[in-house]
């Protein structure tokens, strides 16, 4: 496992859920779907009901107000997106409730949410040079950038 950054020594405090039941699309118009229990993948789907619906929870950070630390949960579940290492799939891990405070190794559950226009980026707090990323016909993983796709569109209020 790659060493944690200095940010992992910080403590993050849960504020509230800031987005409910949204879908993530990448720039190839692939949608994030849940595959094989604890994994996510990106696929071009005909039926949006196959898309994962996420909730986003915000945490406090005393470091940088331009970067919002968030946790990503599959709606109506106790499954949270957890970062591994570079080029490793992100995992869905079960927790009984949303963590009130996060520190140390638990920063695997946190991502800095950055927006640039309609583009959304999720940077691992545990690995600040790595983004949530998709690759064609492959797992959602952590990557530095191309050839993986790291920018997402957030689709809200999908029926």
């Amino acid at each position: 496992s790659a060493p944690f950054s200095f940010l992992s020594n910080m403590t993050y405090h849960f504020i509230r859920i800031i987005k409910h039941e949204f879908i993530l699309n990448d720039t190839l118009n692939q949608t994030i779907i849940r595959a094989n229990d604890q994994y996510l993948t990106a696929a071009a789907i005909h039926n949006l009901d196959e898309a994962v619906k996420f909730d986003m929870g915000a945490y406090t950070s005393s470091k940088d107000d331009t970067k919002v630390p968030v946790i990503l949960r599959i709606s109506k579940t106790q499954l949270y997106v957890s970062a591994q290492d570079e080029d490793q799939p992100v995992l869905l891990k079960e927790m009984p409730e949303i963590p009130k405070t996060i520190t140390g190794s638990e920063t695997n559950f946190l991502f800095f949410w950055e927006t640039h226009g309609t583009k959304n980026y999720f940077i691992s707090v545990a690995h600040p040079n790595l983004f949530i990323a998709t690759k064609h016909d492959n797992w959602v993983c952590l990557a530095k950038g191309l050839p993986s796709i790291t920018d997402f569109q957030i689709l809200e209020n999908q029926a």
Partner: antibody, heavy 122, light 107 residues
Framework: EIQLVQSGAEVKKPGASVKVSCKAS????????MNWVRQAPGQGLEWMGW????????TYADDFKGRFTFTLDTSTSTAYMELSSLRSEDTAVYYC???????????????WGQGTTVTVSS | DIQMTQSPSSLSASVGDRVTITCRAS??????LNWYQQKPGKTPKLLIY???RLRSGVPSRFSGSGSGTDYTFTISSLQPEDIATYFC?????????FGQGTKLEIK
């Protein structure tokens, strides 16, 4: 076109073993779990368990722990269900079924094999 | 484990009738309820997922509703080709249990 094609009917004696195959096509095999469902003659559907087609890890329902084994051959996109120490009450149709998550939370079985009849008789 | 109790176990209705089948879960399943149709001698087929979403190609006379622990499957106007056994299945957590089934016959 998504298809699950199962092996043919089997007639076995008590105490023997049987291995049923389920060959998948038309989708990325590793992206969808494979479920096994039993239907005894004139009875309902029983979820036996499923195998993660990426990791190979299996989950079994309580009634199907011990004598049942799920395996994979990822090179041919084939899932297998093996049943050992056969008994007369194992006589049933065994189905494989692809698992899908709707909204990332609701698990359903959207494509099914044609079923394999296993008859256990002395 | 989540138990699914389906009723009735069998029912007889006439062509054009409205038919209703119920399914009760032993705990809240948050609308994660699916319905399957199995025609005699055939493989099961997913009709409805997530309580009320019709799978592509499924006729609109089929519908589903409910919440919490209680769910309903309805055929608004029974057709001869609807003769089958119908099963509910909870999709919230493994083991993904089925109801006992409802055998539907034409009067």
């Amino acid at each position: 076109e998504i298809q699950l094609v199962q092996s043919g009917a089997e007639v076995k004696k008590p105490g023997a073993s049987v291995k049923v195959s389920c060959k998948a096509s038309g989708y990325t095999f590793a992206h969808y779990g494979m479920n096994w469902v039993r239907q005894a003659p004139g009875q309902g559907l029983e979820w036996m368990g499923w195998i993660n087609t990426y990791t190979g890890q299996s989950t079994y329902a309580d009634d199907f722990k011990g004598r049942f084994t799920f395996t994979l051959d990822t090179s041919t996109s084939t899932a297998y269900m093996e049943l050992s120490s056969l008994r007369s009450e194992d006589t049933a149709v065994y189905y494989c079924a692809r698992g899908i998550y709707y909204f990332g939370s609701n698990y359903a079985m959207d494509y099914w094999g044609q079923g394999t009849t296993v008859t256990v008789s002395s | 484990d989540i138990q699914m109790t389906q009723s009735p176990s069998s029912l007889s209705a006439s062509v054009g009738d409205r038919v209703t089948i119920t399914c009760r879960a032993s705990q809240d399943i948050s609308n994660m309820l699916n319905w399957y149709q199995q025609k005699p001698g055939k493989t099961p087929k997913l009709l409805i997922y997530y309580t009320s979403r019709l799978r592509s190609g499924v006729p609109s006379r089929f519908s589903g509703s409910g919440s919490g622990t209680d769910y309903t499957f309805t055929i608004s106007s029974l057709q001869p080709e609807d003769i089958a056994t119908y099963f509910c299945q909870q999709g919230k957590k493994p083991p993904y249990t089925f109801g006992q089934g409802t055998k539907l016959e034409i009067k």
